[in-house]
């Protein structure tokens, strides 16, 4: 996938495709992040990538495609 | 192509136990959440157990404490431990692909093994 | 704990519409899913998200989702077509399955 980024709240990258180990950004998640797919309403949440819920938080997270980043994959990766 | 087997169930004695294996290929099976559905004779699907590809577990109510799953992806297999049967666990048990992560769909199947708990 | 309700049994004349209902408290705000399994067979996915089809699913085969009841329909039903069919959704990290529809194919 693309790079995978949080709500609006929390910045930096989580993890890449399924299958990695997925951590935390902050110093208190030491445990692995565990995914959903994100409820129904969320379905237009990610403008350029996928969404993703977090389960410990309840909170969605998006995989960007590749030459878009920010939280909601928003924003266009002039550089890519 | 895309495929998955089971094998493992069979006759057995209510408290005895049981481990279910689900041989997965065609896939990179390490990137894909699993679970396990079963069917009682002539009756409807129930979901049984998921586990995430990072390692996340979850149960039905009606099995937590009793059955664990599991996989191995170096040996491409899921696996589900049952202990402590009951007559009411008799069922077709599937073992199927969660599309990406937990909460889409399932999208492959395995043909299904048949566990069967009576003295 | 959340709940699918289907009816028993849907009947449909060869060629006819068939239309198999999926009750839920709001379940238009969730993604339904359907399966169809034949007997002796493992279950196979005819529809996802609502109303989107995998590939290499007919497409007489059609859902939709809203307020509290998701439909499955086929059109110009064959007899290939009899079978149990099965709604599902996610709900509470946990999956659930309506309780199946055998579809009757007449004449």
């Known amino acids: 996938d693309g790079n995978t980024t949080r709500t609006p709240e929390t910045n930096g990258s989580l993890c890449g495709a399924p299958g990695e180990n997925c951590t935390g950004t902050t110093p208190r998640q030491k445990s692995k992040t565990h995914f959903s797919r994100c409820p129904k309403q969320y379905k237009h949440y990610c403008i350029h990538g996928r969404c993703r819920f977090v389960m410990d938080e309840q909170t969605p997270s998006c995989i960007c495609e590749k030459g878009y980043f920010g939280a909601r994959c928003e924003q266009v990766d002039l550089f890519y | 192509q895309v495929q998955l087997l089971e094998s493992g169930g069979g006759l057995v004695q209510p408290g005895g136990s049981l481990r279910l294996s689900c041989a997965a290929s065609?896939?990179?099976?390490?990137?894909?959440?699993m679970s396990w559905v079963r069917q009682a004779p002539g009756k409807g699907l129930e979901w049984v157990s998921g586990?995430?590809?990072?390692?996340?577990?979850t149960y039905t109510d009606s099995v937590k404490g009793r059955f664990t799953i599991s996989r191995d992806n170096s040996k491409n297999t899921l696996y589900l431990q049952m202990n402590s049967l009951r007559a009411e666990d008799t069922a077709v048990y599937y073992c199927?692909?969660?599309?990406?992560?937990?909460?889409?769909?399932?999208?492959?199947w395995g043909q299904g093994t048949l566990v069967t708990v009576s003295s | 704990s959340y709940e699918l309700t289907q009816p028993l049994s849907v009947s449909v004349a060869l060629g006819q519409t068939a239309r198999i209902t999926c009750s839920g408290d709001?379940?238009?705000?969730?993604?339904v899913h359907w399966y169809q399994q034949k007997p002796g067979q493992a279950p196979v996915l005819v529809i996802y998200?609502?109303?989107d089809r995998p590939s290499g699913i007919p497409e007489r085969f059609s859902g939709s989702n809203s307020g509290n009841t998701a439909t499955l329909t086929i059109s110009r039903a064959q007899a290939g077509d009899e079978a149990d069919y099965y709604c599902?959704?996610?709900?509470?990290?946990?999956?659930?399955f309506g309780g199946g529809t055998k579809l009757t194919v007449l004449g």
């Open positions: 586990l995430g590809h990072v390692g996340y577990t």
């Open positions: 998200d609502d109303s």
């Open positions: 599902q959704a996610w709900d509470m990290q946990s999956v659930v």
């Open positions: 199927a692909r969660d599309y990406l992560d937990f909460g889409y769909y399932f999208d492959v």
């Open positions: 709001k379940i238009g705000k969730k993604y």
């Open positions: 065609g896939f990179t099976f390490s990137s894909y959440a």
